[in-house]
């Protein structure tokens, strides 16, 4: 009788994460009597995967019924494979011993590689908003993929970006890998509706890349432009002054009217109109009772946008007395000045 050999016919086995791996092993003889064990790795630190004689191995099933006579097939299936299962598996025949069985012969090993999909890319932008013409950084992260080869691209509104840096970790061998990329994006006033997209392509995705997005509306701050104008006289002693607040984003805005430096009224932007580019317009008006003023009046529209320092625009009302058929009327002239 020829001495028993342990045959592991597959040098490599490639399995997708979540699938079942079949590791094949046959013995060439029924002699010696004794159980089969499967290990991951070799040497003293090897990990027991299955022991025919004893133990509980819920993820492992044998391909053949080991109790059946003449059985020499010791192949196993390992269910619900994860990247952590990658490694070289050895089928080892033991010889019945007393008190303990003795290792007799090992197969040559089967290297199990696990293909794992990357997680959905997560794109994050800067912690604070930035204004147009500034450059901001976006990061993209994806984890848990294997093998290591992966492709990452950045897009802004469908246009590929080139200013980015990407790292795949760890550098050496690992059961799974992570990718981290940082892209630089220059903001424009039209970017409220813009999107930054991180696209990850991997062998496990069958040509259908994963995408993570960030809306620049979360990142951009478009400061308003102010215009203060005087409307025609509405009543004998009243002048209507409006402050047009244009092209701002986000909506959070507070406006204060000052008469000669004294607060007249404060209000919060509510009924705004939205522009096509996603920015907002708003208008506030102030009725000034001219008869209450002997001297010229400096009206200031002061706007605090999104917690930033206030910007303001001023308007000078010239107050002069004109004789009237009955009593007197006060007229007003205006000049404008812009203060920031």
């Amino acid at each position: 009788e020829e001495e028993l050999q342990v045959i592991q016919p597959d040098k490599f086995v490639l399995v997708a994460a979540g699938e079942t791996a079949t590791l094949r092993c046959t013995a060439t003889s029924l002699i010696p009597v004794g159980p089969i064990q499967w290990f991951r790795g070799a040497g003293p630190g090897r990990e027991l995967i299955y022991n025919q004689k004893e133990g509980h191995f819920p993820r492992v099933t044998t391909v053949s019924d080991l109790t059946k006579r003449n059985n020499m097939d010791f192949s196993i299936r390992i269910g619900n494979i994860t990247p952590a299962d990658a490694g070289t598996y050895y089928c080892v025949k033991f010889r019945k011993g007393s008190p303990d069985d003795v290792e007799f012969k090992s197969g040559a090993g089967t290297e199990l590689s696990v293909r794992a999909k990357p997680s959905a890319p997560v794109v994050s932008g800067p912690a604070a908003r930035a204004t147009p013409q500034h450059t901001v950084s976006f990061t993209c992260e994806s984890h848990g993929f294997s093998p290591r080869d992966i492709t990452l691209k950045w897009f802004k509104n469908g246009n590929e970006l080139s200013d980015f840096q990407t790292n795949v970790d760890p550098v050496g061998e690992s059961v799974s890998y992570s990718i981290h990329s940082t892209a630089k994006v220059v903001l424009t006033r039209e970017d409220v509706h813009s999107q930054v997209i991180c696209e990850v392509a991997h062998v496990t995705l069958q040509g259908d890349p994963l995408r993570g997005t960030a809306n620049l509306s979360e990142t951009i701050r478009v400061p308003p432009t102010l215009e203060v104008t005087q409307q025609p006289v509405r009543a004998e002693n009243q002048v209507n002054v409006t402050c047009q607040v244009r092209k701002f984003y986000p909506q959070r805005l507070q406006l204060t009217w000052l008469e000669n430096g004294n607060v007249s009224r404060t209000e919060t932007a509510s009924t705004v109109t939205e522009n096509k580019d996603g920015t907002y317009n708003w208008m506030s008006w102030l009725l000034v009772n001219v008869s209450a003023h002997r001297d010229d009046v400096k009206l200031t529209c002061q706007v605090e946008h999104d917690g930033q320092p206030a910007v303001s625009k001023s308007h000078d009302l010239k107050v002069s007395a004109h004789p009237k058929e009955q009593g007197s009327n006060t007229a007003a002239e205006n000049t404008g000045s812009n203060e920031r």
């Epitope: 002699i31 109790t67 006579r69």
Partner: antibody, heavy 119, light 110 residues
Framework: QVQLVQSGAEVKKPGASVKVSCKAS????????INWVRQAPGQGLEWIAM????????HYNQIFKDRATLTTDTSTSTAYMELRSLRSDDTAVYYC????????????WGRGTLVTVSS | DIVLTQSPDSLAVSLGERATINCRAS??????????IFWYQQKPGQPPKLLIY???NRDSGVPDRFSGSGSGTDFTLTISSLQAEDVAVYYC????????FGQGTKLEIK
Amino acid sequence: QVQLVQSGAEVKKPGASVKVSCKASGYTFTNYWINWVRQAPGQGLEWIAMIDPSDSETHYNQIFKDRATLTTDTSTSTAYMELRSLRSDDTAVYYCAMDYGSLYAMDYWGRGTLVTVSS
Amino acid sequence: DIVLTQSPDSLAVSLGERATINCRASQSVRSSGYNWIFWYQQKPGQPPKLLIYLASNRDSGVPDRFSGSGSGTDFTLTISSLQAEDVAVYYCQHSRELPTFGQGTKLEIK
């Protein structure tokens, strides 16, 4: 360490039944056949039957086919052999034995259970 | 059914001498390249102990003075140098089909 611990001695009357137990430890019970063998006083070994605890597949010696029933309880790793319609010539030591190589052989044995059939 | 016949029924051998026990099958027990014969030793008050499996393979812990040989229908258990602790009854068993035992051979010291 494989161990097979059998139930204690029994005295039965002719026509009665006996159920001998064999509790296994030190190995995965469902992975190996259990055989039952008996030995009458001063006589040789006589194979009764065998059972695969994984699926309860059984093989019986034709002599015992109508009177013996093998069962297992995998939750307690225990095998049972029931013999019905006992006769005086069923007086014997009944052994359970585990087949470690699936060769239909007997590698590890229990200590035996003496069943005495006497009126 | 395959019947196994052992010879002799009993045997007395001097210490240090060779003891030979024979087992003949009523038909061949060879199948799938193996001879499905097993030898057991039973000492008084103890269960049997497996000595030899598949005709010629010593079980673990069995002293190498025990050996098995034969093929087809004729098989032999040999104890090359009898020791006092070898006094026992020896049985052959086949599993070419469902198992059966030989009638046993009682080995004593002369």
